[in-house]
């Protein structure tokens, strides 16, 4: 389980068509 102070930081992963983009790349979301 993530610590409380981490909860508002994004987690970043590689994906395609994520983060409002059409191609593949890194995407960071809370």
């Amino acid at each position: 389980r993530r610590r409380r102070r981490d909860t508002h930081f994004p987690i970043c992963i590689f994906c395609c068509g994520c983060c409002h983009r059409s191609k593949c790349g890194m995407c960071c979301k809370t």
Partner: antibody, heavy 121, light 107 residues
Framework: QVQLVESGGGVVQPGRSLRLSCAAS????????MHWVRQAPGKGLEWVAV????????YYADSVKGRFTISRDNSKNTLYLQMNSLRAEDTAVYYC??????????????WGQGTMVTVSS | SYELTQPPSVSVSPGQTASITCSGD??????ACWYQQKPGQSPILVIY???KRPSGIPERFSGSNSGNTATLTISGTQAMDEADYYC??????????FGGGTKLTVL
């Protein structure tokens, strides 16, 4: 101004350990992912590892996985690379680099000056 | 493992256009970045997300990416542009790939 300064490089024997540091200034360190990238003498760039905002969100190149550990101390604005079981092929200039800001940080937008690591008996 | 292939060297006359290619499997499906590195110096980001220029990078630097090839184009090449250039792309969360680098010579 925005700056990254690496330290901790040197000459080390195969199988030994070394810890590199990267001191960041001029920006809010905790708001950025941070990378280590290396460059063997006369060769190209090779990505080593990244640590994102949460300390547990980190990834490694296959060539260093299980031997190197990336970490950060946001209170000290410092990035680290703990290198264990060093091999001759780890000889390189090691750069720390900042990931782009935002939710799509594909690029490395700020680089340090590098620190040289030589693995030799 | 994935590879990005660049020509080892490209030569151009001052004022002319230089094109540096970066080829890889389905390169056009991922975002390409380009870095400039002069001897004894650290790399500098010149193009990101295929076509975008960071602030401070001259307009003569541009990029494109489709099919299996990303291209860095330098229009009106100047002597100060002589450097090594590296492309870069992500193939997974644990696989950031750099091209082998291209030495640009301004004749």
């Amino acid at each position: 101004q925005v700056q990254l300064v690496e330290s901790g490089g040197g000459v080390v024997q195969p199988g030994r350990s070394l810890r590199l540091s990267c001191a960041a200034s001029g920006f809010t360190f905790s708001n950025y992912g941070m990378h280590w990238v290396r460059q063997a003498p006369g060769k190209g760039l090779e990505w080593v590892a990244v640590i994102w905002y949460v300390g547990s969100n980190k990834y490694y190149a296959d060539s260093v996985k299980g031997r190197f550990t990336i970490s950060r101390d946001n209170s000290k604005n410092t990035l680290y690379l703990q290198m264990n079981s060093l091999r001759a092929e780890d000889t390189a200039v090691y750069y720390c680099a900042r990931a782009q800001e935002g939710m799509a940080p594909d690029a490395f937008d700020i680089w340090g000056q590098g620190t040289m690591v030589t693995v030799s008996s | 493992s994935y590879e990005l292939t660049q020509p080892p060297s490209v030569s151009v006359s001052p004022g002319q256009t230089a094109s540096i290619t970066c080829s890889g499997d389905k390169m056009g499906e991922r975002y390409a970045c380009w870095y400039q590195q002069k001897p004894g110096q650290s790399p500098i980001l010149v193009i990101y997300q295929d076509t975008k220029r960071p602030s401070g990078i001259p307009e003569r630097f541009s990029g494109s990416n489709s099919g299996n090839t990303a291209t860095l184009t330098i229009s009106g090449t100047q002597a100060m542009d002589e450097a090594d250039y590296y492309c870069q792309a992500w193939y997974s969360s644990t696989n950031v790939v750099f091209g082998g680098g291209t030495k640009l010579t301004v004749l």
